[in-house]
Protein backbone atom coordinates (compact mmCIF):
# COMPACT_ATOMS: atom_id res chain seq x y z
CA UNK A 1 0.00 0.00 0.00
CA UNK A 2 1.24 3.49 -0.65
CA UNK A 3 2.50 5.60 2.15
CA UNK A 4 2.01 9.31 1.86
CA UNK A 5 3.95 12.04 3.58
CA UNK A 6 1.14 14.46 2.96
CA UNK A 7 -1.49 15.11 5.55
CA UNK A 8 -4.84 14.28 4.10
CA UNK A 9 -7.52 16.04 6.08
CA UNK A 10 -6.38 19.67 5.92
CA UNK A 11 -5.84 19.63 2.17
CA UNK A 12 -9.07 18.11 0.95
CA UNK A 13 -12.35 19.66 1.97
CA UNK A 14 -14.17 16.94 0.10
CA UNK A 15 -12.79 14.29 2.45
CA UNK A 16 -10.98 12.47 -0.34
CA UNK A 17 -7.54 13.00 -1.80
CA UNK A 18 -8.44 12.06 -5.34
CA UNK A 19 -4.83 11.95 -6.53
CA UNK A 20 -3.95 9.40 -3.88
CA UNK A 21 -7.17 7.47 -4.45
CA UNK A 22 -6.45 7.16 -8.16
CA UNK A 23 -2.81 6.24 -7.69
CA UNK A 24 -3.60 3.65 -5.02
CA UNK A 25 -6.38 2.12 -7.04
CA UNK A 26 -4.10 1.95 -10.05
CA UNK A 27 -1.45 0.21 -7.96
CA UNK A 28 -3.85 -2.50 -6.86
CA UNK A 29 -5.21 -2.92 -10.34
CA UNK A 30 -1.65 -3.39 -11.56
CA UNK A 31 -1.11 -6.11 -9.01
CA UNK A 32 -4.25 -7.92 -10.09
CA UNK A 33 -3.69 -7.53 -13.81
CA UNK A 34 -0.09 -8.57 -13.52
CA UNK A 35 -1.24 -11.79 -11.93
CA UNK A 36 -4.21 -12.46 -14.14
CA UNK A 37 -3.90 -10.33 -17.26
CA UNK A 38 -2.49 -11.24 -20.63
CA UNK A 39 -1.77 -9.11 -23.69
CA UNK A 40 -3.13 -5.88 -22.23
CA UNK A 41 -6.43 -7.36 -21.23
CA UNK A 42 -8.13 -9.50 -18.66
CA UNK A 43 -9.39 -12.51 -20.54
CA UNK A 44 -12.43 -14.46 -19.47
CA UNK A 45 -10.07 -17.19 -18.35
CA UNK A 46 -8.02 -14.75 -16.31
CA UNK A 47 -11.14 -13.26 -14.81
CA UNK A 48 -12.39 -16.75 -13.98
CA UNK A 49 -9.08 -17.52 -12.27
CA UNK A 50 -9.33 -14.36 -10.23
CA UNK A 51 -12.84 -15.22 -9.10
CA UNK A 52 -11.73 -18.73 -8.30
CA UNK A 53 -8.77 -17.63 -6.27
CA UNK A 54 -10.80 -15.22 -4.20
CA UNK A 55 -13.30 -17.98 -3.65
CA UNK A 56 -16.39 -16.70 -5.44
CA UNK A 57 -16.35 -18.78 -8.58
CA UNK A 58 -18.69 -21.44 -7.34
CA UNK A 59 -20.85 -22.55 -4.45
CA UNK A 60 -18.84 -24.01 -1.60
CA UNK A 61 -19.91 -26.42 1.09
CA UNK A 62 -19.46 -24.91 4.54
CA UNK A 63 -19.29 -27.17 7.57
CA UNK A 64 -20.31 -25.39 10.74
CA UNK A 65 -19.35 -26.97 14.03
CA UNK A 66 -20.58 -25.22 17.14
CA UNK A 67 -18.82 -25.39 20.47
CA UNK A 68 -21.96 -25.29 22.56
CA UNK A 69 -24.13 -28.27 23.34
CA UNK A 70 -27.58 -27.57 22.02
CA UNK A 71 -28.51 -29.16 18.70
CA UNK A 72 -30.88 -27.03 16.75
CA UNK A 73 -31.73 -27.89 13.17
CA UNK A 74 -29.53 -25.25 11.63
CA UNK A 75 -26.39 -26.83 13.06
CA UNK A 76 -26.54 -29.69 10.63
CA UNK A 77 -28.51 -28.14 7.84
CA UNK A 78 -25.54 -27.20 5.71
CA UNK A 79 -24.23 -30.76 5.68
CA UNK A 80 -27.40 -32.05 4.09
CA UNK A 81 -28.07 -29.30 1.60
CA UNK A 82 -28.02 -30.16 -2.06
CA UNK A 83 -25.39 -28.24 -3.95
CA UNK A 84 -25.42 -27.37 -7.61
CA UNK A 85 -23.51 -29.61 -9.95
CA UNK A 86 -20.97 -27.03 -10.96
CA UNK A 87 -19.44 -27.24 -7.52
CA UNK A 88 -18.04 -30.61 -8.39
CA UNK A 89 -17.14 -30.33 -12.05
CA UNK A 90 -13.64 -31.28 -13.12
CA UNK A 91 -12.39 -27.94 -14.35
CA UNK A 92 -11.06 -26.93 -10.97
CA UNK A 93 -7.69 -25.32 -10.66
CA UNK A 94 -5.45 -25.30 -7.64
CA UNK A 95 -6.42 -22.79 -5.01
CA UNK A 96 -3.12 -21.80 -3.46
CA UNK A 97 -2.98 -20.49 0.05
CA UNK A 98 0.33 -18.75 -0.43
CA UNK A 99 0.54 -15.03 -0.06
CA UNK A 100 0.71 -12.76 -3.03
CA UNK A 101 2.35 -9.85 -1.36
CA UNK A 102 3.78 -6.85 -3.05
CA UNK A 103 5.88 -3.82 -2.44
CA UNK A 104 4.53 -0.56 -3.61
CA UNK A 105 7.71 0.50 -5.32
CA UNK A 106 7.89 -2.68 -7.32
CA UNK A 107 7.61 -1.99 -11.03
CA UNK A 108 5.02 -4.58 -11.89
CA UNK A 109 4.45 -5.32 -15.51
CA UNK A 110 0.97 -3.93 -15.47
CA UNK A 111 -1.80 -5.06 -17.74
CA UNK A 112 -4.83 -3.50 -19.22
CA UNK A 113 -7.45 -2.92 -16.60
CA UNK A 114 -10.90 -3.27 -17.99
CA UNK A 115 -13.85 -2.36 -15.87
CA UNK A 116 -14.43 -5.89 -14.66
CA UNK A 117 -13.17 -5.86 -11.12
CA UNK A 118 -15.35 -3.20 -9.66
CA UNK A 119 -17.93 -1.77 -12.02
CA UNK A 120 -19.15 1.78 -11.83
CA UNK A 121 -22.18 2.29 -9.69
CA UNK A 122 -24.09 3.85 -12.54
CA UNK A 123 -25.96 1.52 -14.83
CA UNK A 124 -25.22 3.15 -18.13
CA UNK A 125 -22.06 1.71 -19.56
CA UNK A 126 -23.49 0.66 -22.88
CA UNK A 127 -21.65 3.31 -24.83
CA UNK A 128 -18.22 2.11 -23.82
CA UNK A 129 -15.84 0.19 -26.00
CA UNK A 130 -14.62 -2.61 -23.74
CA UNK A 131 -11.08 -2.26 -25.04
CA UNK A 132 -11.09 1.43 -24.23
CA UNK A 133 -13.13 1.27 -21.09
CA UNK A 134 -10.77 0.95 -18.21
CA UNK A 135 -12.86 3.13 -16.04
CA UNK A 136 -11.85 5.42 -13.23
CA UNK A 137 -8.16 4.93 -13.31
CA UNK A 138 -8.27 1.37 -14.57
CA UNK A 139 -5.90 1.86 -17.39
CA UNK A 140 -3.31 0.08 -19.50
CA UNK A 141 0.23 0.43 -18.23
CA UNK A 142 3.20 -0.24 -20.46
CA UNK A 143 5.81 -2.86 -19.73
CA UNK A 144 8.06 -0.70 -17.63
CA UNK A 145 10.03 -3.46 -16.01
CA UNK A 146 10.83 -5.19 -19.28
CA UNK A 147 9.59 -8.57 -18.13
CA UNK A 148 7.65 -10.58 -20.62
CA UNK A 149 4.19 -11.69 -19.76
CA UNK A 150 4.68 -15.43 -19.50
CA UNK A 151 2.39 -17.84 -17.71
CA UNK A 152 3.45 -21.14 -16.26
CA UNK A 153 1.57 -24.36 -16.48
CA UNK A 154 1.44 -26.74 -13.57
CA UNK A 155 1.11 -30.47 -13.49
CA UNK A 156 -0.11 -32.11 -10.33
CA UNK A 157 0.01 -35.73 -9.35
CA UNK A 158 -2.40 -35.48 -6.49
CA UNK A 159 -5.61 -33.88 -5.43
CA UNK A 160 -4.95 -30.58 -3.70
CA UNK A 161 -6.91 -29.29 -0.79
CA UNK A 162 -7.09 -25.91 0.84
CA UNK A 163 -8.77 -25.65 4.20
CA UNK A 164 -9.31 -22.31 5.88
CA UNK A 165 -10.16 -22.50 9.55
CA UNK A 166 -11.81 -19.73 11.47
CA UNK A 167 -11.98 -20.84 15.06
CA UNK A 168 -14.26 -18.73 17.17
CA UNK A 169 -17.50 -19.27 19.09
CA UNK A 170 -18.51 -21.68 16.38
CA UNK A 171 -15.84 -23.34 14.28
CA UNK A 172 -16.33 -22.83 10.57
CA UNK A 173 -14.52 -24.92 8.01
CA UNK A 174 -14.50 -23.92 4.37
CA UNK A 175 -13.21 -26.85 2.41
CA UNK A 176 -12.29 -26.52 -1.21
CA UNK A 177 -11.02 -29.65 -2.87
CA UNK A 178 -9.75 -29.11 -6.35
CA UNK A 179 -7.81 -31.10 -8.92
CA UNK A 180 -5.72 -29.07 -11.33
CA UNK A 181 -5.64 -30.38 -14.84
CA UNK A 182 -2.22 -30.76 -16.47
CA UNK A 183 -1.35 -27.85 -18.67
CA UNK A 184 -3.65 -25.38 -17.00
CA UNK A 185 -2.23 -21.90 -16.60
CA UNK A 186 -1.77 -20.18 -13.28
CA UNK A 187 -1.43 -16.51 -12.50
CA UNK A 188 1.98 -15.05 -11.88
CA UNK A 189 3.50 -14.02 -8.59
CA UNK A 190 3.70 -10.28 -8.87
CA UNK A 191 6.37 -9.87 -6.26
CA UNK A 192 9.12 -12.18 -7.36
CA UNK A 193 11.91 -10.63 -9.36
CA UNK A 194 14.37 -13.44 -8.64
CA UNK A 195 13.66 -17.12 -9.04
CA UNK A 196 12.06 -18.27 -5.80
CA UNK A 197 11.94 -21.86 -4.69
CA UNK A 198 8.84 -23.97 -4.61
CA UNK A 199 7.63 -24.18 -1.06
CA UNK A 200 8.21 -27.47 0.69
CA UNK A 201 4.63 -27.50 1.83
CA UNK A 202 3.33 -27.16 -1.67
CA UNK A 203 1.18 -30.06 -2.71
CA UNK A 204 1.95 -29.51 -6.35
CA UNK A 205 4.42 -32.14 -7.46
CA UNK A 206 6.29 -30.17 -10.07
CA UNK A 207 6.30 -27.12 -12.25
CA UNK A 208 6.54 -27.73 -15.96
CA UNK A 209 5.51 -26.69 -19.40
CA UNK A 210 7.09 -23.28 -19.69
CA UNK A 211 6.19 -21.36 -22.79
CA UNK A 212 8.86 -21.62 -25.49
CA UNK A 213 9.20 -17.85 -25.82
CA UNK A 214 10.32 -17.47 -22.21
CA UNK A 215 13.98 -16.60 -21.83
CA UNK A 216 16.14 -18.98 -19.87
CA UNK A 217 17.24 -16.33 -17.41
CA UNK A 218 13.77 -15.09 -16.69
CA UNK A 219 12.29 -16.14 -13.37
CA UNK A 220 9.25 -18.35 -13.50
CA UNK A 221 6.40 -16.45 -11.99
CA UNK A 222 4.14 -19.33 -11.09
CA UNK A 223 1.17 -18.99 -8.81
CA UNK A 224 2.51 -21.69 -6.54
CA UNK A 225 5.85 -20.15 -5.70
CA UNK A 226 6.54 -19.22 -2.13
CA UNK A 227 7.51 -15.65 -1.51
CA UNK A 228 11.12 -14.69 -0.99
CA UNK A 229 12.17 -15.09 2.62
CA UNK A 230 13.44 -11.53 2.90
CA UNK A 231 10.15 -10.03 1.89
CA UNK A 232 7.20 -9.21 4.10
CA UNK A 233 3.68 -10.26 3.22
CA UNK A 234 1.26 -7.57 2.21
CA UNK A 235 -0.26 -6.12 5.32
CA UNK A 236 -3.82 -6.89 6.25
CA UNK A 237 -5.46 -3.48 6.14
CA UNK A 238 -8.55 -2.83 8.17
CA UNK A 239 -11.23 -0.33 7.19
CA UNK A 240 -9.40 2.68 8.57
CA UNK A 241 -6.15 1.81 6.84
CA UNK A 242 -7.88 1.07 3.56
CA UNK A 243 -9.54 4.46 3.68
CA UNK A 244 -6.48 6.44 4.66
CA UNK A 245 -4.28 4.71 2.11
CA UNK A 246 -6.70 6.01 -0.52
CA UNK A 247 -6.71 9.51 0.87
CA UNK A 248 -10.15 9.21 2.40
CA UNK A 249 -11.30 10.38 5.79
CA UNK A 250 -12.44 7.79 8.29
CA UNK A 251 -15.11 9.91 9.94
CA UNK A 252 -17.36 10.54 6.95
CA UNK A 253 -19.72 8.10 5.26
CA UNK A 254 -18.62 6.69 1.92
CA UNK A 255 -20.65 7.37 -1.16
CA UNK A 256 -20.63 5.06 -4.17
CA UNK A 257 -17.95 7.05 -6.01
CA UNK A 258 -15.60 6.83 -3.05
CA UNK A 259 -16.29 3.17 -2.45
CA UNK A 260 -15.47 2.51 -6.09
CA UNK A 261 -11.89 3.60 -5.48
CA UNK A 262 -11.53 0.94 -2.79
CA UNK A 263 -12.69 -2.04 -4.83
CA UNK A 264 -9.34 -3.07 -6.35
CA UNK A 265 -7.63 -2.87 -2.97
CA UNK A 266 -10.30 -5.02 -1.38
CA UNK A 267 -10.08 -7.61 -4.15
CA UNK A 268 -6.29 -7.52 -4.09
CA UNK A 269 -6.25 -8.00 -0.33
CA UNK A 270 -8.54 -11.01 -0.61
CA UNK A 271 -6.56 -12.46 -3.50
CA UNK A 272 -3.24 -11.89 -1.72
CA UNK A 273 -4.52 -13.73 1.35
CA UNK A 274 -3.31 -10.71 3.30
CA UNK A 275 -5.66 -11.40 6.18
CA UNK A 276 -5.08 -15.12 6.49
CA UNK A 277 -2.58 -16.64 8.88
CA UNK A 278 -1.12 -19.72 7.27
CA UNK A 279 -1.06 -22.26 10.03
CA UNK A 280 0.50 -25.69 9.86
CA UNK A 281 -1.30 -28.35 7.87
CA UNK A 282 -1.48 -30.48 11.01
CA UNK A 283 -4.81 -29.63 12.57
CA UNK A 284 -3.46 -30.55 15.99
CA UNK A 285 -1.17 -27.55 15.86
CA UNK A 286 -4.06 -25.10 15.69
CA UNK A 287 -4.83 -23.84 19.20
CA UNK A 288 -8.52 -24.10 19.98
CA UNK A 289 -9.12 -20.39 20.43
CA UNK A 290 -6.82 -18.82 17.85
CA UNK A 291 -7.84 -17.28 14.57
CA UNK A 292 -6.47 -18.23 11.21
CA UNK A 293 -8.51 -15.42 9.73
CA UNK A 294 -7.63 -12.01 11.10
CA UNK A 295 -10.46 -9.68 11.91
CA UNK A 296 -9.98 -6.96 9.33
CA UNK A 297 -13.09 -4.85 9.66
Amino acid sequence: FPQTTEKISPNWESGINVDLAISTRQYHLQQLFYRYGENNSLSVEGFRKLLQNIGIDKIKRIHIHHDHDHHSDHEHHSDHERHSDHEHHSEHEHHSDHDHHSHHNHAASGKNKRKALCPDHDSDSSGKDPRNSQGKGAHRPEHASGRRNVKDSVSASEVTSTVYNTVSEGTHFLETIETPRPGKLFPKDVSSSTPPSVTSKSRVSRLAGRKTNESVSEPRKGFMYSRNTNENPQECFNASKLLTSHGMGIQVPLNATEFNYLCPAIINQIDARSCLIHTSEKKAEIPPKTYSLQIAW
Epitope: Q3, I16, A107, A108, G110, G135, T257
Partner: antibody
Protein backbone atom coordinates in the same frame (compact mmCIF):
# COMPACT_ATOMS: atom_id res chain seq x y z
CA UNK B 1 4.11 21.82 0.89
CA UNK B 2 3.44 20.08 -2.42
CA UNK B 3 5.47 21.43 -5.31
CA UNK B 4 6.46 20.33 -8.80
CA UNK B 5 9.33 22.18 -10.45
CA UNK B 6 10.20 21.72 -14.09
CA UNK B 7 13.51 22.23 -15.83
CA UNK B 8 14.21 21.88 -19.51
CA UNK B 9 15.12 23.71 -22.70
CA UNK B 10 12.87 26.30 -24.25
CA UNK B 11 13.99 25.80 -27.83
CA UNK B 12 14.21 22.52 -29.70
CA UNK B 13 15.30 21.95 -33.27
CA UNK B 14 12.89 20.14 -35.57
CA UNK B 15 13.35 16.35 -35.53
CA UNK B 16 15.27 16.61 -32.25
CA UNK B 17 14.12 15.36 -28.87
CA UNK B 18 12.75 17.20 -25.86
CA UNK B 19 13.78 16.32 -22.32
CA UNK B 20 12.15 17.83 -19.23
CA UNK B 21 12.78 16.97 -15.60
CA UNK B 22 10.06 17.39 -12.99
CA UNK B 23 11.34 17.50 -9.42
CA UNK B 24 8.66 17.02 -6.80
CA UNK B 25 8.57 17.84 -3.11
CA UNK B 26 6.00 17.44 -0.38
CA UNK B 27 4.94 14.00 -1.54
CA UNK B 28 6.49 10.71 -2.56
CA UNK B 29 6.65 9.25 -6.05
CA UNK B 30 5.99 5.87 -4.47
CA UNK B 31 2.55 7.11 -3.44
CA UNK B 32 1.43 9.24 -6.37
CA UNK B 33 1.48 9.02 -10.13
CA UNK B 34 2.81 11.98 -12.10
CA UNK B 35 1.12 13.07 -15.30
CA UNK B 36 2.31 15.12 -18.26
CA UNK B 37 0.05 17.54 -20.08
CA UNK B 38 0.74 20.07 -22.78
CA UNK B 39 -1.15 23.16 -23.85
CA UNK B 40 -1.02 24.87 -27.20
CA UNK B 41 -3.18 27.57 -28.77
CA UNK B 42 -4.23 25.26 -31.58
CA UNK B 43 -4.99 22.07 -29.69
CA UNK B 44 -5.75 23.22 -26.16
CA UNK B 45 -4.87 20.93 -23.28
CA UNK B 46 -3.66 17.45 -24.18
CA UNK B 47 -2.90 14.68 -21.74
CA UNK B 48 0.34 12.98 -22.81
CA UNK B 49 1.02 10.24 -20.27
CA UNK B 50 1.58 9.19 -16.70
CA UNK B 51 4.10 7.25 -14.68
CA UNK B 52 2.52 5.32 -11.85
CA UNK B 53 3.88 4.55 -8.41
CA UNK B 54 5.38 1.22 -9.40
CA UNK B 55 7.09 2.66 -12.46
CA UNK B 56 4.61 1.50 -15.04
CA UNK B 57 3.45 4.02 -17.60
CA UNK B 58 0.39 4.87 -19.62
CA UNK B 59 0.73 6.94 -22.75
CA UNK B 60 -1.70 8.74 -24.98
CA UNK B 61 -1.79 6.54 -28.07
CA UNK B 62 -1.24 9.57 -30.26
CA UNK B 63 2.20 10.09 -28.70
CA UNK B 64 3.14 6.60 -27.60
CA UNK B 65 5.66 5.90 -30.33
CA UNK B 66 7.84 8.86 -29.47
CA UNK B 67 7.22 9.39 -25.78
CA UNK B 68 9.08 8.03 -22.78
CA UNK B 69 8.46 8.77 -19.10
CA UNK B 70 10.71 7.48 -16.33
CA UNK B 71 11.59 8.44 -12.78
CA UNK B 72 14.03 8.22 -9.93
CA UNK B 73 12.12 7.79 -6.69
CA UNK B 74 15.12 8.49 -4.48
CA UNK B 75 15.70 11.84 -6.15
CA UNK B 76 11.99 12.61 -6.43
CA UNK B 77 12.45 13.27 -10.12
CA UNK B 78 10.33 12.38 -13.13
CA UNK B 79 11.86 12.46 -16.59
CA UNK B 80 9.92 13.25 -19.74
CA UNK B 81 11.36 12.64 -23.19
CA UNK B 82 9.64 13.18 -26.52
CA UNK B 83 11.37 12.39 -29.78
CA UNK B 84 11.06 13.74 -33.30
CA UNK B 85 9.55 17.08 -32.42
CA UNK B 86 7.95 19.18 -35.13
CA UNK B 87 6.63 22.73 -35.24
CA UNK B 88 3.18 21.62 -34.13
CA UNK B 89 4.69 20.28 -30.90
CA UNK B 90 5.30 23.86 -29.82
CA UNK B 91 3.43 24.16 -26.51
CA UNK B 92 3.68 24.63 -22.78
CA UNK B 93 4.52 21.28 -21.18
CA UNK B 94 3.35 20.60 -17.62
CA UNK B 95 3.97 17.88 -15.10
CA UNK B 96 1.12 17.42 -12.65
CA UNK B 97 0.00 15.21 -9.81
CA UNK B 98 -3.39 15.25 -11.45
CA UNK B 99 -6.22 15.58 -11.38
CA UNK B 100 -5.38 18.16 -8.72
CA UNK B 101 -4.17 21.71 -8.41
CA UNK B 102 -0.62 20.50 -8.08
CA UNK B 103 0.94 21.33 -11.42
CA UNK B 104 4.42 22.37 -12.37
CA UNK B 105 5.02 25.91 -13.54
CA UNK B 106 5.13 24.78 -17.14
CA UNK B 107 7.92 24.72 -19.70
CA UNK B 108 7.36 26.70 -22.86
CA UNK B 109 8.85 24.68 -25.67
CA UNK B 110 9.29 26.19 -29.10
CA UNK B 111 10.20 23.91 -31.97
CA UNK B 112 12.00 25.96 -34.55
CA UNK B 113 15.11 25.92 -36.68
CA UNK C 1 -10.92 8.85 -27.22
CA UNK C 2 -13.63 10.57 -25.24
CA UNK C 3 -14.38 14.03 -26.53
CA UNK C 4 -15.24 16.68 -23.97
CA UNK C 5 -17.20 19.47 -25.63
CA UNK C 6 -17.57 22.93 -24.14
CA UNK C 7 -19.93 24.45 -26.64
CA UNK C 8 -19.54 28.01 -25.42
CA UNK C 9 -16.09 29.40 -26.08
CA UNK C 10 -16.90 32.72 -24.46
CA UNK C 11 -19.36 33.78 -21.80
CA UNK C 12 -20.03 37.28 -20.61
CA UNK C 13 -21.37 38.04 -17.17
CA UNK C 14 -21.48 40.77 -14.57
CA UNK C 15 -20.18 40.90 -11.04
CA UNK C 16 -22.76 39.41 -8.70
CA UNK C 17 -24.39 37.33 -11.43
CA UNK C 18 -24.71 33.59 -11.61
CA UNK C 19 -23.18 31.77 -14.58
CA UNK C 20 -23.12 28.14 -15.65
CA UNK C 21 -20.37 26.62 -17.79
CA UNK C 22 -21.36 23.36 -19.44
CA UNK C 23 -19.40 20.38 -20.67
CA UNK C 24 -20.61 17.33 -22.57
CA UNK C 25 -18.76 14.01 -22.80
CA UNK C 26 -19.02 11.88 -25.93
CA UNK C 27 -19.64 8.83 -23.73
CA UNK C 28 -20.36 8.02 -20.13
CA UNK C 29 -17.60 9.12 -17.76
CA UNK C 30 -19.54 8.51 -14.55
CA UNK C 31 -18.66 11.35 -12.18
CA UNK C 32 -14.96 11.43 -13.04
CA UNK C 33 -14.75 15.03 -14.10
CA UNK C 34 -12.50 17.85 -12.92
CA UNK C 35 -13.04 21.55 -13.51
CA UNK C 36 -10.01 23.80 -13.86
CA UNK C 37 -9.64 27.55 -13.76
CA UNK C 38 -6.76 29.04 -15.71
CA UNK C 39 -5.77 32.66 -15.52
CA UNK C 40 -3.45 34.20 -18.14
CA UNK C 41 0.18 33.14 -17.64
CA UNK C 42 -0.65 30.61 -14.94
CA UNK C 43 -0.94 26.86 -14.69
CA UNK C 44 -4.44 25.43 -14.48
CA UNK C 45 -5.91 25.37 -10.98
CA UNK C 46 -8.34 22.60 -10.08
CA UNK C 47 -11.60 23.79 -8.56
CA UNK C 48 -13.77 20.69 -8.50
CA UNK C 49 -13.08 16.96 -8.74
CA UNK C 50 -15.41 13.99 -8.99
CA UNK C 51 -17.97 16.33 -10.58
CA UNK C 52 -19.02 18.04 -7.37
CA UNK C 53 -16.22 17.89 -4.78
CA UNK C 54 -14.70 21.27 -4.13
CA UNK C 55 -10.97 21.42 -3.47
CA UNK C 56 -9.70 23.00 -0.30
CA UNK C 57 -9.51 26.76 -0.51
CA UNK C 58 -11.94 27.03 -3.40
CA UNK C 59 -14.75 29.48 -2.60
CA UNK C 60 -18.13 27.88 -2.11
CA UNK C 61 -19.59 29.99 -4.89
CA UNK C 62 -18.10 27.38 -7.23
CA UNK C 63 -20.27 24.29 -7.48
CA UNK C 64 -20.24 21.35 -9.85
CA UNK C 65 -22.98 19.00 -10.91
CA UNK C 66 -23.82 16.33 -13.42
CA UNK C 67 -23.20 12.67 -14.12
CA UNK C 68 -22.67 10.43 -17.09
CA UNK C 69 -22.25 12.77 -20.03
CA UNK C 70 -23.49 16.19 -18.96
CA UNK C 71 -21.64 18.36 -16.49
CA UNK C 72 -21.97 21.91 -15.24
CA UNK C 73 -19.76 24.29 -13.32
CA UNK C 74 -21.82 27.02 -11.70
CA UNK C 75 -20.35 30.23 -10.35
CA UNK C 76 -22.79 32.13 -8.19
CA UNK C 77 -22.14 35.71 -7.17
CA UNK C 78 -19.42 36.14 -9.80
CA UNK C 79 -16.42 38.18 -8.68
CA UNK C 80 -13.96 40.12 -10.81
CA UNK C 81 -11.20 37.67 -9.92
CA UNK C 82 -13.21 34.92 -11.60
CA UNK C 83 -12.14 36.32 -14.98
CA UNK C 84 -10.42 33.26 -16.42
CA UNK C 85 -10.76 30.32 -18.76
CA UNK C 86 -12.52 27.23 -17.43
CA UNK C 87 -11.77 23.70 -18.60
CA UNK C 88 -13.45 20.41 -17.89
CA UNK C 89 -11.48 17.16 -17.94
CA UNK C 90 -12.53 13.54 -17.70
CA UNK C 91 -10.37 10.97 -15.94
CA UNK C 92 -12.63 7.98 -16.41
CA UNK C 93 -10.81 6.59 -19.43
CA UNK C 94 -7.36 6.96 -20.83
CA UNK C 95 -6.32 9.10 -22.49
CA UNK C 96 -7.62 11.70 -20.09
CA UNK C 97 -9.17 14.41 -22.21
CA UNK C 98 -10.00 18.07 -21.73
CA UNK C 99 -12.70 20.34 -22.98
CA UNK C 100 -11.72 23.18 -25.28
CA UNK C 101 -12.28 25.77 -22.59
CA UNK C 102 -14.77 28.55 -21.89
CA UNK C 103 -13.49 32.07 -21.35
CA UNK C 104 -15.43 34.04 -18.81
CA UNK C 105 -15.55 37.76 -19.46
CA UNK C 106 -16.70 40.26 -16.89
CA UNK C 107 -18.82 43.09 -18.25
Amino acid sequence: QVQLKQSGPGLVQPSQSLSITCTVSGFSLTSYGVHWVRQSPGKGLEWLGVIWTGGTTDYNAAFKSRLSISKDNSKSQVFFKMNSLQANDTAIYYCARGPSSYWGQGTLVTVSA
Amino acid sequence: DIVMTQSQKFMSTSVGDRVSVTCKASQNVDTNVVWYQQKPGQSPKALIHSTSYRYSGVPDRFTGSGSGTDFTLTISNVQSEDLAEYFCQQYNNYPWTFGGGTKLEIK
